[in-house]
Interface confidence: low
């Protein structure tokens, strides 16, 4: 007999859940020498503990510290790339340049990237058939905890000069409910971050406007500037040319036209 | 930790061409630029291209524009380098080399190397 | 292109004395130089890159300073082992180039 389930407004969780989260960590830390030690297994088991038989609008970034602590991982300074509703072409440039991270390039990032989980009150299983909305239901839900958590880490540990990519297209290019704007603004050390390089992604073919002027760009550079870090703000009007300059700089239309620099 | 891992010697006679294979194994292949250097004998070290395999986006230095051709085969981690109309002063070691890079423009240095192939061109 | 220029050509110096090699480009190449070692009949081995940082496994003796045209690598205290050619690699602008490289024998 089929026990009764709470019905929540968002997706269930991922079909195959456990068996794509142990996949992808056996296969990143194949691919990452660095991560050679992480015990895959052990990841799962923190993974599965921070949400199983716990409420599912009830979580919190302790429910997460195991994970976070096996999870342990340090990019180098000035490799850092954040970014805002633009997460395709942020980790189409990383594929690039593959010396640039994004969160979903770091291990706990990838593990979780696109993925939907959740269990319920006092049972051991995954609910497949619907998890909270973030809107409709609940905030403190397994997947917004998580990403708030690893958001909040990848930010503190973040040094050097930082990278935000940021969609010119929308009406908020900057949008302080974002994640980066919620949460990894905030979590940038001053004393270890010297300066946030906003990247303004256009959208248009013929949009030559600069929108490093924007009044959400020049919010984003009042809350970074309070906090003692510089600001620099970069137009990146043809993301397709850009990308194509990435992956062949030596093309001479490459040498100016796909981005213009504003210093503040 | 990844090995690059090259073809044995050849030798070629002079106008013909020559291909040299470089076999990733032990890690990621695909994302990386596999560069190709060569060096003559009792000589310093030349760039001559490059690949991206992910992106199949290859590059030559404009010396050996038209004569060289680099490809990659994603499926066996092998990456290629041909060289055509060979002569006498193509006479070297030639090496396969894992880029790592810089953002933005793709600057890089190269981190692990292939042990080397000699193709002598003599008649 | 760039031009890369080594010196000395060759260095003569006694095991456990300090050896200081130079590099200098034709134009600015920013931090964006690698040093290279090489011994007889094996493949370069990447000691230093962005100028100053020591790649992985390298001891400490071998470290790089400078940026824009001059650089220098230094090895603090001659080990046997280290004995070889060394060469310096600018990838700031197309095509990357080696300098023609220093010969660091035994004095």
């Known amino acids: 007999v089929p026990r009764w389930r709470q019905q929540w407004s968002g997706s269930g969780t991922t079909s195959r859940f456990p068996e794509t989260v142990l996949a992808r960590c056996v296969k990143y830390t194949e691919v990452h020498p660095e991560m050679r030690h992480v015990d895959c297994q052990s990841v799962w088991d923190a993974f599965k503990g921070a949400f199983i038989s716990k409420y599912p609008c009830n979580i919190t970034e302790e429910d997460y510290q195991p994970l976070v602590k096996l999870g342990t991982q340090t990019v180098p300074c000035n490799k850092t790339l954040l970014w805002s509703r633009i997460k395709d072409l942020a980790h189409q440039f990383t594929q690039v340049q593959r010396d640039m991270f994004t969160l979903e390039d770091m291990l706990l990032g990838y593990l979780a990237d696109d993925l939907t989980w959740c269990g319920e009150f006092n049972t051991f299983e995954i609910n497949y058939q619907s998890c909270p909305d973030w809107r409709k239901d609940c905030s403190n839900n397994p997947v917004s905890v998580f990403w708030k958590t690893v958001s909040r880490r990848f930010a503190e540990t973040a040094c050097g000069v930082v990278h935000v990519m940021l969609n010119g297209s929308r009406s908020k290019i900057f949008d302080k409910n974002s994640t980066f704007g919620s949460v990894e603004v905030h979590n940038l050390q001053p004393e270890k971050v010297q300066a946030l390089e906003a990247w303004v992604i256009h959208g248009g073919r013929e949009d030559s406007r600069d929108l490093c002027q924007d009044p959400t760009i020049k919010e984003l550079e009042s809350i970074i500037s309070k906090r003692n870090i510089r600001f620099f703000c970069k137009n990146i009007y043809r993301p397709d040319k850009f990308l194509q300059c990435v992956k062949n700089p030596e093309d001479s239309s490459c040498l100016s036209g796909i981005h213009h620099h504003h210093h503040h | 930790q990844v090995q690059l891992v090259q073809s044995g010697a050849e030798v070629k006679k002079p106008g013909s061409s020559v291909k040299v294979s470089c076999k990733a194994s032990g890690g990621s292949f695909s994302n990386y630029a596999i560069g190709w250097v060569r060096q003559a004998p009792g000589q310093g070290l030349e760039w001559m291209g490059r690949?991206?395999?992910?992106?199949?986006?290859?590059h030559y230095a404009q010396k050996f524009q038209g004569r060289v051709t680099i490809t990659a085969d994603e499926s066996t981690s092998t990456a290629y380098m041909e060289l055509s109309s060979l002569r006498s002063e193509d006479t070297a070691v030639y090496y396969c080399?894992?880029?790592?890079?810089?953002?933005?423009?793709?600057?890089?240095?190269?981190?692990?190397w292939g042990q080397g192939t000699l193709v002598t061109v003599s008649s | 292109e760039i031009v890369m220029t080594q010196s000395p050509a060759t260095l003569s110096v006694s095991p456990g004395e300090r050896a200081t090699l130079s590099c200098r480009a034709s134009q600015s190449v920013s931090s964006n130089l690698a040093w290279y070692q090489q011994k007889p009949g094996q493949a370069p081995r990447l000691l230093i890159y962005g100028a100053s940082t020591r790649a992985t496994g390298i001891p400490a003796r071998f470290s790089g300073s400078g940026s824009g045209t001059e650089f220098t690598l230094t090895i603090s205290s001659l080990q046997s082992e280290d004995f070889a050619v060394y060469y310096c690699?600018?990838?700031?602008?197309?095509?990357?180039?080696f300098g023609q490289g220093t010969k660091v024998e035994i004095k």
């Open positions: 080399a894992r880029g790592l890079g810089y953002y933005l423009y793709s600057s890089y240095y190269f981190d692990i």
């Open positions: 690699q600018q990838y700031n602008n197309w095509p990357w180039t």
């Open positions: 690949i991206i395999p992910v992106l199949d986006a290859a």
